[in-house]
């Protein structure tokens, strides 16, 4: 039960994280105009990965896409790439993890296959989360560098009297969304990897041996396990706990409502 819960929770957390990464990538507020210690502007500038926007005091907002590819800073291109890689890996991870979920039955898929798929999706989520965190951090570092550079020469004198105020940009909402989303995806990935360990079938050093006593249908299993009666007993190498309780796989042939989140 704990394994199913861990896997399910990992899936849900990763799903939220990837949705957040997609949202952050699409958002326009990666950097917003710094209004502190600046003449109060009647126009508010903010920029995203794909376009820059201006909001006037009337509420009118005008956005312009970055229609050039070669003219953009290499760092911006790198951030775009990291975010897209994060989304793609996350999406594939989600697809894989859906089939790996214990509560979903696909034909006669072995537990070992589900365990492998869970591990694969977990690793994908971890890499996806790291890509998002890296992308957002690179952009944040770029902002900090530019901020202090523009602060150093904020007022560039032109002919003495005339001044040009350089627009300084600070962290936008998308950065925080990206950091949180990347973290969630990472946590979800770790949870999937932990769940994978619980899903993997445990190999024992002993093979089950059946001794047929006359008149009795009793199968004796060494290794400290309680004997199970009947010839048609499960030959799969599963632990049978004291008190005759069956494994989760035997009890629950169909997914219950509690396994769906």
């Amino acid at each position: 039960m704990a394994v199913t819960a861990c896997q399910g929770l990992g899936f849900v957390v990763s799903l939220i994280g990837i949705a957040g990464i997609i949202a952050a990538t699409c958002m326009d507020q990666w950097s917003t105009q710094d209004l502190y210690n600046n003449p109060v502007t009647a126009v508010f500038n903010y920029q995203g990965l794909w376009r820059s926007c201006v909001r006037e005091s009337s509420g009118f907002t005008e956005c312009r896409g970055y229609f050039t590819l070669l003219g953009l800073p290499a760092m911006l291109q790198a951030v775009r790439a990291l975010m897209i890689v994060g989304i793609v890996l996350g999406a594939i991870g989600l697809l894989v993890s859906i089939f790996a979920l214990k509560c979903i039955r696909i034909g006669s898929m072995e537990d070992s296959a589900k365990a492998n798929m869970t591990l694969t999706s977990g690793i994908m989520f971890i890499v996806s989360g790291l890509c998002a965190i890296a992308g957002v951090s690179v952009f944040a570092n770029m902002l900090v560098t530019n901020f202090w550079m523009s602060t150093a020469n904020m007022y560039t004198g032109m002919g003495g009297m005339v001044q040009t105020v350089q627009t300084r940009y600070t962290f936008g909402a998308a950065l925080f969304v990206g950091w949180v989303a990347g973290g969630l995806t990472l946590i979800g990935g770790v949870m999937m990897c932990i769940a994978c360990r619980g899903l993997a079938p445990e190999e024992t050093n002993y093979k089950a041996v059946s001794y047929h006593a006359s008149g009795h249908s009793v199968a004796y299993k060494p290794g400290g396990f309680k004997a199970s009666t009947g010839f048609g007993s499960n030959t799969k190498n599963k632990k049978i706990y004291d008190g005759g309780a069956r494994t989760e796989d035997e009890v629950q042939s169909y997914p219950s409502k509690h396994d769906y989140v």
Epitope: P39, T41, V43, N45, V54, G59, F60, V165
Partner: antibody, heavy 120, light 113 residues
Amino acid sequence: EVQLQQSGPELVKPGASVKMSCKASGYTFTSYVIHWVKQKPGQGLEWIGYINPYNDGSKYNEKFKGKATLTSDKSSSTAYMELSSLTSEDSAVYYCAREGYGKRNALDYWGQGTSVTVSS
Amino acid sequence: DIVMTQSPSSLSVSAGERVTMSCKSSQSLLNSGNQKNYLAWYQQKPGQPPKLLIYGASTRESGVPDRFTGSGSGTDFTLIISSVQVEDLAVYYCQNDHFYPLTFGAGTKLELK
């Protein structure tokens, strides 16, 4: 047709207060910001501040903080400006003007003005 | 506050003449975000409220005759009336629309020669 109808002229005593109105018609009142501008006789224009009727958010020229109070009433599509502690320096024509949407913050429609005379 | 300096303060013209008036701002009115200038020109006739002629430094307001042309960028702006008509005699104001407080120039008075 867009119209901003301002209240009539006011003759007030020094130290008193005056509240003038600006009734908007011909457009959705809450969709546009209303600015107020002062013009002394024979002089230039001076921006007082603006009010956004949608959320009652306002911004003032530092010079007029404490002097002017901007409010609005959505139900009657009317913007108001109250001037307090009046002196002869406040004798002027006060205009309300609508900020055009997508017009780079320019004021596209103006009221006819309210003349305020401060005299004892 | 942004200081808007208009020149000349008054102009004496004859009907049909081409008129050029200047407006300089103490700070650039060019917004880096959209590369647009936040400057407007208004016309005010005696006893009337100002009327918007040009916004964004060069965009003519609807209904404004095409003899009015706005140009310039950053800190230097110009309003040109290609052929002055009698009804154009008024005071012309430029306005900073970029920074609060929004500020106006002292005006250029257009008079008949």
